[in-house]
Interface confidence: medium
């Protein structure tokens, strides 16, 4: 329109009018039912995981315990969080908790993403120490796995999860009966700069929680896929007759990850290429009712790690086994076995067969054969 | 083309009744919240009441509760306000408004008021004896 | 409620000025503000929202500025079409409430 142009036939209707965005309507009780499932599998699920840990001898622990313990911290704390989140969404978006717990529990979400990719990081980046450079990196993987790497990666999830707990607060937006807990980008940015705030915080945790620690990883498998395929022509051994499958803990545990996290930073990245690329209206207004769904399926991450180590690692199931039946007399008996290998102890799943230097069935193991056998996941 | 058309204005006598309707075209009328505006002969603009796409939120101006009801009829892309106990304050020229809300990708739950984007005419409503 | 008090009521200007609204709240309302201009026997018509967003269509020589409780409406340039009754608008809250009219004239 022109400068000076009058503007009597202009109805107020501006270029977003197509899109016409209505308030987004929960499908019920589903999203609160998942998030209280999740709650409730998330919270035994992992304390069982931390149990099973801290139980074994420190001398039985191996380095990827303490990333595996980590991921389950950081499980736990989020999952504890989950009721609230369960009831804002039942509510129909009222916050009935205060600003406090909003900040907290939305806090909570991220320093779980950061610290979970990193702890995932962190083991894959100890399985390539381990199967790749085995000799080498001994007191390298003795130093990475102990206490500074584990703190290092919280510190850097706390300080990257900071902005959420700045931004958040609670707001009777509009003054109605209902209060909201939402980014409030008004105290860091003015109005017309509050959009690219969202995008470079929405890039950014995409980029740091999502894109890099998986680059790293998939650059972890490559050489350790490469290792194990070089090994594998050159060796036959007599234990491990089916070929076991190396690592597989770890890698469902990335894998599953990435599922559960991939719709969640997908979406989002999509919606905010929408300001750029401008996208038809319903392909933006779809973004926009499926975003709550995939951000539900990424929490429904926080409770599958322990059904993933039941499922995939033996050790895992007679830790949960002895802990069910440890009060129990005819227990008693099993729970110790001459070869200490009925201790219970969850060795993040470095499975070492049923005795020091056993393959499947008891058959003796050459560790020569296999000089990372202690160190890696060996699982049917 | 996006249009607002009221009707049923008139001459009401003071304590009678009277109801308002706004009928929209050119745009999916239930996808949006709804608003009532009035002016007063010489005066400035008055906000009256609002709706919620579904009818589950509506909201008024304090001098009106109790007396007006907006309501909405998706089906006939209509908007109503029935008016009853009329004073003579209530002389004014209804208009009828499209709200325009942007909403929040992140955070569900929370939307931002863009103003009244599109506005009827209006139709006249005069309470005398 | 809450109120809003614009001023001036009423300003004389010529084609060209550059003319400035300002509208005060009573209380802080971030940037919850919208500005609508109406013509006589007209309705009115949004030109700012959000305190400081054009409206798509309408002229750039209409912009908006502030947060809180002090918000401005300037016209720079002003055209024939712009004499006119400008108002504006709070949302923070309910119930929403107007300014009381700024009436821009020709000097």
């Known amino acids: 329109m022109e400068e000076g142009g009058d503007f009597d036939n202009y109805y107020g209707a501006d270029n977003q009018s197509e899109c016409e965005y209505t308030d987004w309507k929960s499908s019920g009780a589903l999203i609160p039912a998942i998030y209280m499932l999740v709650f409730l599998l998330g919270t035994t699920g992992n304390g069982l995981v931390l149990w099973t840990v801290f139980r074994s001898s420190r001398e039985k622990r191996r380095s990827a315990d303490i990333f595996i313990a980590s991921l389950a911290v950081a499980d736990l704390t989020f999952v504890v969080t989950l009721p609230l989140w369960a009831t804002y969404t039942y509510r129909d978006y009222d916050w009935p908790f205060g600003t406090f717990f909003c900040k907290l529990s939305s806090y909570l979400i991220f320093v779980n993403m950061y610290a979970s990719v990193f702890c995932l990081t962190g083991l894959s980046f100890d399985r390539y120490l381990a199967i790749v450079r085995p000799v080498a990196n001994a007191r390298l993987r003795l130093r990475v796995s102990g206490a500074v790497a584990t703190a290092v990666l919280w510190v850097l999830a706390a300080l990257l999860a900071m902005p959420v707990m700045v931004l958040r607060t609670t707001g009777d937006l509009e003054n109605t009966t209902k209060v909201q807990c939402y980014m409030d980008y008004s105290m860091v940015a003015t109005v017309s700069s509050e959009w690219a705030w969202e995008v470079g915080l929405g890039v950014s945790s995409t980029t740091v929680g999502f894109v890099v620690p998986f680059t790293i990883m998939l650059t972890c498998y490559f050489f350790i896929a490469q290792t194990i395929a070089g090994h594998f022509r050159k060796e036959r051994i007599e234990g491990l007759r089916k070929r076991r499958r190396l690592l597989s803990i770890i890698v469902v545990l990335v894998v599953t990850f990435a599922l559960c996290w991939m719709p969640y930073h997908l979406v989002k990245t999509l919606y905010m290429l929408g300001s750029l690329l401008h996208w038809p209206c319903d392909f933006d207004l779809f973004l926009m009712n499926i975003f709550p769904y995939c951000t539900c399926i990424s929490y429904v991450n926080s409770c599958l790690n322990p059904f993933l180590y039941a499922f995939f690692d033996p050790r895992f199931r007679q830790a949960c086994t002895s802990m069910l039946c440890c009060g129990q007399s005819r227990c008693a008996g099993t729970s110790h076995s001459s070869s200490g290998e009925k201790s219970a102890s969850y060795s993040s799943g470095h499975s070492q067969g049923p005795g020091p230097n056993m393959g499947k069935g008891g058959e003796q193991m050459h560790e020569k054969s296999i000089p990372y056998s202690q160190e890696t996941l060996v699982v049917d | 083309e996006v249009q607002l058309v009221e009707s049923g204005g008139g001459l009401v006598q003071p304590g009678g009744s009277l109801r308002l309707s706004c009928v929209a075209s050119?745009?999916?009328?239930?996808?949006?919240?709804m608003s009532w505006v009035r002016q007063a002969p010489g005066k400035g603009l008055e906000w009256v009441a609002n709706?919620?796409?579904?009818?589950?939120?509506?909201y008024y101006v304090d001098s009106v509760k109790g007396r007006f009801t907006i309501s909405r009829g998706d089906a006939k892309n209509s908007l109503y306000l029935q008016m009853k106990s009329l004073r003579a304050e209530d002389t004014a020229v209804y208009f009828c408004a499209r709200d325009r809300f942007g909403y929040s990708f992140y955070d569900k739950g929370v939307r931002y008021y863009y103003g009244m984007d599109v506005w009827g005419q209006g139709t006249t409503v005069t309470v005398s004896s | 409620d809450i109120q809003m008090t614009q001023s001036p009521s009423s300003l004389s200007a010529s084609v060209g000025d550059r003319v400035t609204i300002t509208c005060r709240a009573s209380?802080?309302?971030?940037?919850?503000l919208g500005w609508y201009q109406q013509r006589p026997g007209k309705a009115p018509k949004r030109l700012i929202y959000a305190a400081s967003s054009l409206q798509t269509g309408v002229p750039s020589r209409f912009s908006g500025s502030g947060s809180g409780t002090e918000f401005t409406l300037t016209i720079s340039g002003l055209q024939p079409d712009d004499f006119a009754t400008y108002y504006c608008l709070q949302h923070n809250s309910y119930p929403r409430t107007f300014g009381q009219g700024t009436k821009v004239e020709i000097r």
């Open positions: 050119g745009f999916t009328f239930n996808n949006y919240w």
């Open positions: 209380q802080g309302i971030r940037n919850d």
């Open positions: 709706i919620k796409q579904d009818g589950s939120e509506r």
